[in-house]
Interface confidence: medium
């Protein structure tokens, strides 16, 4: 069937539309297009004869139409008047006629809208504002946006005039927002520029800051007033009812007791004509003395001495406060306060007790802080550490050892080799060492103030030959699927390559195996029972190589789900029942049995002689591994039949 499709159906003014013909018959003589829903010679747009390929304009031809050999009609530079129906009249070679009608609609391209307002400065809680979207356009839809969001639902918002007008009743300061309107028709959509609603409000009740109402004589009084207001409020200050100044801030330096009184801030909005006031009462007190801290021991020794800190001066009816590290006192059995809180005693001081300490005297209005006091806690020396950590050196290199021990005052250091004093320095340097420099190197750290001394001994071996290494482990009994194990190849030696073997083979590639620390450490993540192998480490340098004895990893695992044997579940009355339970586990698990939920014996084998049908039921084997903390179990149903009642039954054990 002959049909006409309009592409597009909705056409913007000035654009073009194609009336596309579908199912055009074969063997045509020609065709004509007409404006309207019927064939009317007065409304013919164009005719076309196929034989001559001649197009003939009709009375309705505007010069904007083009006809195609496939009978489709293109209309360009569309005008509003083009809206409507179009009829195609087809004349076949047998002079039989056929008709089809199509249509399209023309819409104007919308202009950019704008917003007009009936009130540019509405007053909060008093005025209404009506926004209108201009211009008025036929067949257009109107939409509104507030802060680029669609309109909220509110009883104070009302749309009218075909949504062209948005009215805000009883405006509030929260209505101060960006408003836009949008016009839409089938062919275009345009949005206006923003209009910001400027709502006049306030002043609200002013707030005076700071909130502090008590001051010390000699301080500066600096009060600031703020009231929410649009436009911003104008401020005035009154002291005890007397006007002082028209500023937002009131500053009075070096106040005295005479400055006590009521301080009023008045906020005024010239546009709304409203005034609001707030009053604060300021009290000025006479100056108390600044406290200070005295100590009974300025250089206490760690873990030996106690220190009593006292807050001076002593004033009757005064509250004393303490701070450590700018925090209030922590709860600690080593911290004790006297009954009047004036003395803070630190029992058995530690190096972490240095402070700073502050005390305070609290009066009616404020707290006076002392200057901070820092304790000089004498401590240490701790066990010295000798670096670097190498123990093996090759002949001809320089040996440079450094010693450090935490200490206050800083430690004095001495070096001994094989028990003999060498020098009183923190660093020991020996150039071009030989095998003779092998020995016990002792660093002695001494604290002259506490009189304490600590030593650390390091064994140094100088040899071209490497020693036989050994493997240390951080976990001798790891649990399967839970623990990691780190093997370390000892000793640490300079210019040495570290190698590893597992069961005599080089390390397999595995994401669970990781080498670190210059290949000196081998870490096995998430160990499994298959990791229970022999591990060997090797060390080598340019002149020698050596391997450690193997270390076998003892992986704790299981218990796995147990197996009860024999597998038979049917027995004849009078047979012996002999069930054995086995579960893979390291170490071997503990076994126990339950029959029909009732605990039996703690053995791996359950034996019942001459069973009867009374022995029917569920037989559960429970296994537990105390080392892994894991348990497992399995249940087996046993059926005992009277002799000869069933073929194929087990004769028992």
């Amino acid at each position: 069937k002959l049909t006409i499709e309009s592409t597009p159906f909705n056409v913007a003014e000035g654009k073009e539309v194609l009336l596309l013909v579908h199912n055009l018959p074969q063997h045509l003589f020609g065709y004509s297009w007409y404006k309207g829903e019927r064939v009317d010679g007065n409304r013919q747009i164009i005719g076309y004869v196929i034989g001559t390929q001649q197009a003939t304009p009709g009375p309705a031809y505007s010069g904007r139409e083009i006809i195609y050999p496939n009978a489709s009609l293109l209309i360009q530079n569309i005008i509003q008047n083009d809206t409507g129906f179009y009829t195609l009249h087809v004349i076949k070679s047998d002079l039989v006629n056929e008709e089809a009608t199509g249509q399209f609609r023309v819409y104007p391209e919308l202009p950019k809208p704008s917003i007009s307002s009936n009130n540019s400065k509405p007053v909060e809680d008093k005025d209404a504002v009506a926004f209108t979207c201009e211009p008025e356009t036929q067949d257009a839809t109107y939409l509104w946006w507030v802060n680029n969001q669609s309109l909220p639902v509110s009883p104070r918002l009302q749309l009218s005039n075909g949504n062209r007008t948005l009215t805000l009743f009883n405006v509030t300061r929260n209505d101060t927002a960006s408003y836009k309107c949008e016009t839409q028709n089938p062919v275009s959509a345009r949005r206006s520029d923003s209009v910001i609603l400027n709502v006049l409000y306030g002043p609200d009740a002013p707030t005076i800051s700071p909130l502090n109402t008590s001051y010390r004589s000699g301080e500066n009084l600096n009060l600031s007033c703020h009231a929410a207001s649009n436009p911003p409020a104008q401020y005035s200050w009154f002291v005890n009812g007397t006007f002082q100044q028209s500023t937002q801030e009131l500053f009075i330096p070096n106040i005295t007791v005479n400055n006590s009184g009521s301080y009023t801030c008045q906020a005024h909005n010239s546009d709304t004509g409203l005034n609001r006031t707030t009053v604060t009462t300021i009290t000025v007190y006479a100056e108390p003395p600044k406290p200070f801290i005295t100590s009974n021991n300025s250089n206490p020794v760690e873990d030996e001495d106690a220190v009593a800190l006292t807050c001076e001066p002593e004033i009757q009816n005064t509250t004393y406060l303490w701070w450590v590290n700018n925090q209030s006192l922590p709860v600690s059995p080593r911290l004790q306060l006297s009954n009047d809180n004036r003395t803070l005693t630190l029992l058995s001081v530690t190096r972490n007790d240095v402070g700073p300490y502050e005390c305070g005297i609290q009066n009616e209005l404020s707290v006076d802080h002392s200057d901070p006091v820092i304790l000089n806690v004498l401590y240490g020396p701790d066990d010295p550490t000798i670096s670097p950590s190498y123990t093996y050196y090759r002949p001809g290199v320089n040996l440079s050892l450094s010693c450090h021990a935490a200490s206050n005052p800083p430690a004095q250091y001495s070096w001994l080799i094989d028990g003999n004093i060498q020098q009183h320095t923190q660093e020991l340097f020996i150039s071009n060492i030989t095998e003779k420099n092998s020995g016990l190197y002792t660093c002695q750290a001494n604290n002259s103030a506490s009189g304490h001394s600590r030593t650390t001994v390091k064994t140094i071996t100088v040899s071209a030959e490497l020693p036989k290494p050994s493997i240390s482990s951080n976990n001798s009994k790891p649990v399967e699927d839970k623990d990691a194990v780190a093997f370390t190849c000892e000793p640490e030696a300079q210019n040495t390559t570290y190698l590893w073997w597992v069961n005599g083979q080089s390390l397999p590639v595995s994401p669970r195996l990781q080498l670190s620390n210059g290949n000196r450490t081998l870490t096995l993540f998430n160990v499994t029972r298959n990791d229970a192998r022999a591990y060997v480490c090797g060390i080598q340098n340019s002149v020698s190589a050596n391997r450690s004895d193997p270390v076998t990893l003892d992986v704790l695992y299981g218990p796995d789900t147990p197996i009860i044997s024999p597998p038979d579940s049917s027995y004849l009355s009078g047979a012996n029942l002999n069930l054995s339970c086995h579960s893979a586990s390291n170490p071997s698990p503990q076994y126990s049995w339950r029959i029909n939920g009732i605990p039996q014996q703690h053995t791996q084998v359950l034996f019942i002689a001459k069973i009867t049908p009374n022995n029917n039921g569920t037989y559960a084997c429970f296994v537990s591994n105390l080392a892994t903390g894991r348990n497992n179990s399995i249940v087996k149903s046993i059926t005992v039949s009277a002799s000869g009642t069933s073929p194929g039954l087990s004769a028992g054990a």
Epitope: T391, D418, G419, N420, T434, E435, K436, S438, G439, L440, T456, V457, K458, T459, I460, T461, S463, E465, P467, K468, E490
Partner: antibody, heavy 124, light 110 residues
Framework: EVQLQQSGAELVRSGASVKMSCTAS????????MHWVKQRPEQGLEWIGW????????EYAPKFQGKATMTTDYSSNTAYLQLSSLTSEDTAVYYC?????????????????WGAGTTVAVSS | DIVLTQSPASLTVSLGLRATISCRAS??????????MHWYQQRPGQPPKLLIY???NLQSGVPARFSGSGSGTDFTLNIHPVEEEDAATYYC????????FGGGTKLEIK
């Protein structure tokens, strides 16, 4: 073969001095500390001291300070022990020894090579 | 000085059995992973011979029936099984500071 060859027995008068020798073969003494040990008849072992033949550094057990003097001559690969102001208390076998020639070792005072000993008898 | 006390002073053990000799130090002779205690055997008329170094390491050429153990202040020399040629005096020696020897233990075989 690594060896320490000690000088023969000495019979000396009380108050006199004696100097015994210890010659190394199979190794160079300047590469090792040389030690001396005293053993009185039917008694235990006492360490006298060590010498570093390379630079002549010495260290003595407090008991032998002033009594013993250790020296070396590394051109002849020999170490010497001299004992002065001899008394009957000095009658003993004196061994020279050294450390760690045949094993990896981590301290200088470790004696795995010993001389056969020099017997010193002090007569009044 | 570190004083080494050996016990017993003398010991008689039947052939094939175990001999155990103890050595106690007046302060620890262990440091940085090593124990600086060594054992010697001295047969009559001969110089001492190194058996064990660093508490538990068997000197090259020494039979495996000799073993050493211990750390800190308490050390032990074990001989098992005892053979006739083991009749000798055994000394412990430390090298943690200036070296000293124990008083010796005389082992006789019956």
């Amino acid at each position: 073969e690594v060896q320490l060859q000690q000088s023969g027995a000495e019979l000396v008068r009380s108050g006199a001095s004696v100097k015994m020798s210890c010659t190394a073969s199979g190794f160079n003494i300047k590469d090792y500390y040389m030690h001396w040990v005293k053993q009185r008849p039917e008694q235990g072992l006492e360490w006298i001291g060590w010498i570093d033949p390379e630079n002549g550094d010495t260290e003595y057990a407090p008991k032998f300070q002033g009594k013993a003097t250790m020296t070396t001559d590394y051109s002849s690969n020999t170490a010497y022990l001299q004992l002065s102001s001899l008394t009957s208390e000095d009658t003993a076998v004196y061994y020279c020894n050294t450390r760690g020639l045949s094993t990896m070792i981590t301290t200088r005072w470790f004696f795995d090579v010993w001389g056969a000993g020099t017997t010193v008898a002090v007569s009044s | 000085d570190i004083v080494l006390t050996q016990s017993p002073a003398s010991l008689t053990v039947s052939l094939g059995l175990r001999a155990t000799i103890s050595c106690r130090a007046s302060k620890s002779v262990s440091a940085s992973g090593y124990s600086y205690m060594h054992w010697y055997q001295q047969r009559p008329g001969q110089p001492p011979k190194l058996l064990i170094y660093l508490a538990s390491n068997l000197q090259s050429g020494v039979p495996a029936r000799f073993s050493g153990s211990g750390s800190g202040t308490d050390f032990t020399l074990n001989i098992h099984p005892v053979e006739e040629e083991d009749a000798a005096t055994y000394y412990c020696q430390h090298s943690r500071e200036l070296p000293t020897f124990g008083g010796g233990t005389k082992l006789e075989i019956k």
